[in-house]
């Protein structure tokens, strides 16, 4: 029975050329997280955090993606093309998969509003 919930940073905006943290948090479950997948709006995988093997950043994103903090992901050197949906998929035992959605808007303006549904400590 899937009792858990995924909280995400929700809809966020960031400045072109800057960086942004994508963060998901799984709560309300005793399930064990075995892998977290991060993917982009076109379903291409950005990165995987495997419980045993650690982080794997996919080659196309190696220069612009940094692992962490925690199970999150940091996108750097943002371009306008980075605007869109991002998904975290938590593979958990024995619950199954939990999926969270974040919408990132990359702004041309010098000042970008940054709103989040929760603060990362």
């Amino acid at each position: 029975m899937m009792t858990g919930t995924i909280e995400t940073t929700g809809n966020i905006s960031a400045k072109k050329g800057g960086s942004v943290i994508l963060q998901c948090h799984l709560s309300s479950t005793m399930a064990q997280v075995t892998q977290v997948n991060w993917e982009q709006h076109d379903h291409s995988l950005l990165a995987i955090r495997n419980a045993e093997l650690g982080w794997h950043i996919y080659p196309a994103f190696k220069d612009r993606v940094a692992p962490g903090p925690g199970l999150g992901l940091t996108l750097q050197s943002l371009t306008m093309n980075d605007t869109g949906e991002y998904f975290c998929t938590y593979h958990t035992y024995p619950d199954g998969t939990y999926r969270g959605r974040i919408f990132l808007e990359v702004l041309e303006s010098s000042v970008a509003e940054h709103s989040a549904r929760f603060q990362i400590p």
């Epitope: 005793m30 075995t34 495997n50 419980a51 035992y93």
Partner: antibody, heavy 122, light 107 residues
């Protein structure tokens, strides 16, 4: 080599307690959930439940609540099963088994301990 | 709870035979099914996971197929060491039950 090594067979009297240990080696203990499976003589396999090796939180299948306790000592990469107030019907082989596979569609019990025979008899 | 029913419970066959064991689930479990082999007095050994993926080190004469509610384990050519007991297990929705087992005996 990835392996799980369990403690030896035990003979106990009704009402006593027993602790079965399961020592893991060859992998990162806290990266894989650990399960316990019972097999009564001449019978099939019964999943008793599992323990989250990250948090130590145990989950028990219906029928294995109350007298059964799963625990861990991560400093020595060992999982434990304790059974209290033993009854004759607890006589069985108890196995620990690692959940292998990292994605939900590939989970399975990929590494098993050799089993520990617990006999309850007066 | 999802129940698994294996058939047959006993199977008599000869060395070299092709045999098939069926596992039926009481509800749809996608491809979340594993097959295990157990020798008497030994721990089970994982043969197949995700319904059809052969576990590393397992001989290629073993294969698995199916999805949804009906699954099969096939041994293409029985070897003397294959005359043991086989179990299916679903890993889709708690609790992860096992089938009752199929004992393969020498005819």
């Amino acid at each position: 080599e990835v392996q799980l090594v369990q403690s030896g067979s035990d003979l106990k009297k009704p009402g006593a307690s027993v602790r079965v240990s399961c020592k893991a080696s060859g992998y990162t203990f806290t990266s894989y959930p650990m399960n316990w499976v019972r097999q009564a003589p001449g019978h099939g396999l019964e999943w008793m439940g599992w323990i989250n090796t990250n948090t130590g939180n145990p989950t028990y299948v219906q029928g294995f609540t109350g007298r059964f306790v799963f625990s861990l000592d991560t400093s020595v990469n060992t999982a434990y099963l304790q059974i209290s107030s033993l009854k004759a019907e607890d006589t069985a082989v108890y196995f620990c088994a690692r959940t292998g596979g990292h994605t939900y569609d590939s989970y399975a019990f990929d590494v098993w301990g050799q089993g520990t025979m617990v006999t309850v008899s007066s | 709870d999802i129940q698994l029913t294996q058939s047959p419970t006993f199977l008599s066959a000869s060395v070299g035979d092709r045999v098939t064991i069926t596992c039926r689930a009481s509800q749809v479990i996608s491809s979340s099914l594993a097959w295990y082999q157990q020798n008497p007095g030994k721990a089970p050994k994982l043969l197949i996971y995700a319904a059809s993926t052969l576990q590393s080190g397992v001989p290629s004469r073993f294969s698995g197929s199916g999805s949804g509610t009906e699954f099969t384990l096939t041994i293409s050519s029985l070897q003397p060491e294959d005359f043991v007991t086989y179990y299916c297990q679903h890993l889709h929705g708690y609790p992860y039950n096992f089938g009752q087992g199929t004992k393969v005996e020498i005819k």
